[in-house]
């Protein structure tokens, strides 16, 4: 048993927030400023991440654990860890590769980030249009014409475009 | 891993229709949307429309209005393009694929294994 | 109609370079991004550069993506050419952010 201790790597000694320093005899030194060791037993420590440009600092680099970025206002986060920054659109847009544009006829985005989306198809449910549909806003469904009360009606949705043919409402 | 399974293919009668299936996984099957895109033998890539499965929006490519029809069972994360009236320039690869929700023109990142229908007496 | 035109067929040797356009008949190919598929036969497609220059994780660097405005075309080329290159290249682009369009396609013969 003794043997196996005496075998065993004796950079596995240090902690996080240092690293196994080959060139002082594998003495366990502390991070040096600006990186980091979120695990022990490392022969390196690994170099915080600068939140610089559009990112901005969410939670500033330690010893231990590396600094963690959001995006600057106007811009939203993508990616795991928020890799990179897109852009805000309004609502009733999304993103393009010209910047943001209006949700075509039929869709809409009630976000700032996203894409726009069909409006809800009521009829898959039996129902009819109660509300119709923005660029903002989805349409709101309400009862099926045969549910309505004599007198009352749903409002008719305008027809839908042509090309692409958007399904009816 | 994300996944997309298509099925539902093989033979058909002209003037017969059919029920394709794409079963997904590995995502949240309700914030994108699914394309379905066709190939004809020896040809290119033919859309066919596409569908929000979060709340059943479709769209259609003007060729297929009328003709086909998209659902999806969120239950099931089972996107169905059915399509009637089939003649024999419908035979083709029927592939299903999936965009990304980043930006409104972006690519198809996953695409199904493709289902083979073949239109013939 | 909005229409990508690709060429039909390319050929060139290993280790050499080729480049397959993809040209777009009416509007300005800067309006929206171009994005290009590899098919391998029996396959479906996978997708070699999207958003006009980008390569998804497991690409190799030797395919790159480019837009030239004053020709209104996007290309794909390949430098360092293999014979598992072969295959068919879809472009890929939009007529409105709901209808994607797709070239013809082009078949490349690594000789």
């Known amino acids: 048993f003794e043997r196996t201790r005496s075998l065993q790597d004796p950079c596995s000694n240090c902690p996080a927030g240092t690293f196994c320093d080959n060139n002082r005899n594998q003495i366990c030194s502390p991070c040096p400023p600006n990186s980091f060791s979120s695990a022990g037993g490392q022969r390196t420590c690994d170099i915080c991440r600068q939140c610089k440009g559009v990112f901005r600092t969410r939670k500033e680099c330690s010893s231990t654990s590396n600094a963690e970025c959001d995006c600057t206002p106007g811009f939203h986060c993508l990616g795991a860890g928020c890799s990179m920054c897109e852009q805000d659109c309004k609502q009733g847009q999304e993103l393009t590769k010209k910047g943001c544009k209006d949700c075509c006829f039929g869709t809409f985005n009630d976000q700032k980030r996203g894409i726009c989306r069909p409006w809800t198809n009521c009829s898959l449910d039996g129902k009819s249009v109660l509300v119709n549909g923005t660029k903002e806003r989805d349409v709101v469904c309400g009862p099926s014409p045969a549910d309505l009360s004599p007198g009352a009606s749903s409002v008719t949705p305008p027809a839908p475009a042509r090309e692409p043919g958007h399904s009816p409402q | 891993e994300v996944q997309l399974v298509e099925s539902g293919g093989g033979l058909v009668q002209p003037g017969g229709s059919l029920r394709l299936s794409c079963a997904a996984s590995g995502y949240t099957f309700t914030s994108y949307y699914i394309y379905w895109v066709r190939q004809a033998p020896g040809k290119g890539l033919e859309w066919i429309g596409n569908?929000?499965?979060?709340?059943?929006?479709?769209f259609y490519g003007e060729k297929f209005m009328g003709r086909a029809t998209f659902s999806a069972d969120t239950s099931k994360n089972t996107a169905y393009l059915q399509m009637n009236s089939l003649r024999a320039e419908d035979t083709a690869v029927y592939y299903c694929?999936?965009?990304?929700?980043?930006?409104?023109?972006?690519?198809?990142?996953?695409w199904g294994q493709g289902t083979l229908v073949t239109v013939s007496s | 109609n909005v229409m990508l035109t690709q060429p039909h067929s390319v050929s060139e040797s290993p280790g050499k370079t080729v480049t397959i356009s993809c040209k777009l008949n009416s509007g300005n190919i800067g309006s929206y991004y171009v994005h290009w598929y590899q098919q391998r036969p029996g396959s479906s497609p996978t997708t070699m550069i999207y958003?006009?220059?980008?390569?998804p994780d497991g690409v190799p660097d030797r395919f790159s993506g480019s837009i030239d405005s004053s020709s209104n075309s996007a290309s794909l080329t390949i430098s360092g050419l293999k014979t598992e290159d072969e295959a068919d290249y879809y472009c890929?682009?939009?007529?409105?952010?709901?209808?994607?369009?797709f070239g013809g396609g082009t078949k490349l013969t690594v000789l």
């Open positions: 694929a999936r965009r990304p929700d980043y930006s409104g023109d972006d690519y198809f990142d996953y």
């Open positions: 958003r006009d220059d980008k390569r």
């Open positions: 569908i929000w499965p979060g709340n059943g929006g479709t």
């Open positions: 890929h682009s939009y007529d409105s952010t709901i209808t994607p369009v």
